[in-house]
């Protein structure tokens, strides 16, 4: 069954945590649907963003952070492992020095920590996708 | 009650027709939600687009056409009558020489016909909005 989009969930992250998302683009890549995942510092959507991950399907991926309300230096990748009309599984793992983004089991993107992942309080998944799974796995202590 | 988004409806347009849309942005303007309305030449979403109207809320509106699969010259406006979190009523009227776009009763944008409006077979409304009304009014002959 489908989860509501935008989908918002409270989350605490640290090294070893993984956020897993399953979904499908809602339009053909010719029409450039988007997927966005934002790791926020508060439960409010206007809050700062520790990790911003935006896919323009068929075109590019941009990653960034929003600090004190201002967007910082954007990181862009043309790597496009997503397929038109097909379900994807996205997993974002918190490594000691960076986020590692896997698409359908393949390491596809990395983003160095700019703000410690412990600052994350909420994850939002939104834009032009249907969402069937959202999970945050916590490292067993 | 809410209409599904993306929302697709078969439509025939000619001078005097008006497409009316009521909706609300799904995210705060700081996060740049989008609204898109596309007038297609076929019931397929990959088909050509006679009139493409895209709002990046808080930033700009772009209008264009997609002919033989290729985007043409983009028309951009910074006029931003939409408000954060508030319902909008958008009406697109087919005039003899152009489309006239009204936002909350005010003429806000125009786009000269590049392809005759009679070529339109389908209208799609999508991206980061909730949709409460979609109507096509036809000129009484």
């Amino acid at each position: 069954s489908l989860l509501p989009v935008p989908y918002t969930e409270a989350a605490s992250l640290s090294t070893g945590s993984t956020v897993t998302i399953k979904g499908r683009p809602l339009a053909c890549f010719l029409n450039e649907p988007y997927l966005q995942v934002d790791f926020h510092t508060e439960m409010k959507e206007e809050s700062d963003i520790v990790f911003h991950f935006q896919v323009c399907f068929g075109r590019r991926v941009v990653m960034n952070s929003r600090e004190y309300g201002a967007w910082k230096q954007q990181v862009e990748s043309k790597n496009m492992p997503f397929q038109d009309g097909q379900e994807f599984e996205l997993s974002i793992s918190v490594l000691p020095d960076k986020y590692q983004v896997m698409v359908n089991g393949q390491s596809s993107y990395t983003f160095d920590h700019r703000i410690k992942p412990e600052a994350v309080k909420m994850v939002q998944v939104w834009r032009d996708i249907s969402l069937t799974k959202f999970n945050v796995s916590y490292l067993k202590r | 009650s809410l209409l599904p988004v993306p929302y697709t409806e078969a439509a025939s347009l000619s001078t005097g027709s008006t497409v009316t849309i009521k909706g609300r942005p799904l995210a705060c303007f700081l996060n740049e939600p989008y609204l898109q309305v596309d007038f297609h030449t076929e019931m397929k979403e990959e088909s050509d687009i006679v009139f493409h109207f895209q709002v990046c809320f808080g930033r700009r509106v772009v209008m264009n056409s997609r002919e033989y699969g290729a985007w043409k010259q983009q028309v951009e406006s910074k006029n931003m009558p939409f408000q954060d979190g508030q319902e909008f009523e958008l009406s697109i009227s087919v005039l003899p020489d152009k489309y006239q776009v009204m936002v909350n009763g005010q003429s806000s944008y125009t786009f000269d016909h590049r392809i005759k409006p009679e070529a339109v077979k389908m209208v799609q409304v999508w991206r980061d909005i909730s949709l409460t009304k979609f109507n096509v009014s036809y000129l009484k002959r």
């Epitope: 929003r66 004190y68 309300g69 | 705060c28 808080g58 931003m80």
Partner: nanobody, 121 residues
Framework: QVQVQESGGGLVQAGNSLRLSCAAS????????MMWFRQAPGKEREFVAA???????YCANSVKGRCTISRDNAKDTVYLQMNSLKPEDTAVYFC???????????????WGKGTLVTVSS
């Protein structure tokens, strides 16, 4: 936290132009939507113009065609250019900052103290 301060008001002849400035301080200025309002003696505060954090703009019907709003994020400043001024434009002009792009004075997060504009016929 954002502090805002207006300047550029004064006495102007009808038909002339005026540019008001709003200087903001605070490291989050670029993420705020900025608005101008005005209040004539004995009247409610009314919306004049808005510029979103990403540069979208809107002017109220009362000033449409005579109003240009712009911002310079490098200088943390917003400008309101008013042309073809009329005596009914006489008011105290206020600059405001908001995290929400709305044209409602009650939704503003921060206000300046205002600058008086008097248009003489």
């Amino acid at each position: 936290q954002v502090q805002v301060q207006e300047s550029g008001g004064g006495l102007v002849q009808a038909g002339n132009s005026l540019r008001l400035s709003c200087a903001a301080s605070g490291r989050t200025f670029s993420s705020y939507h900025m608005m101008w309002f005005r209040q004539a003696p004995g009247k409610e505060r009314e919306f004049v113009a808005a510029i979103a954090w990403r540069g979208g703009t809107y002017c109220a019907n009362s000033v449409k065609g005579r109003c240009t709003i712009s911002r310079d994020n490098a200088k943390d400043t917003v400008y309101l250019q008013m042309n073809s001024l009329k005596p009914e434009d006489t008011a105290v002009y206020f600059c405001a900052a908001s995290l929400r792009y709305v044209f409602d004075p009650s939704a503003m997060d921060y206000w300046g103290k205002g600058t008086l504009v008097t248009v003489s016929s």
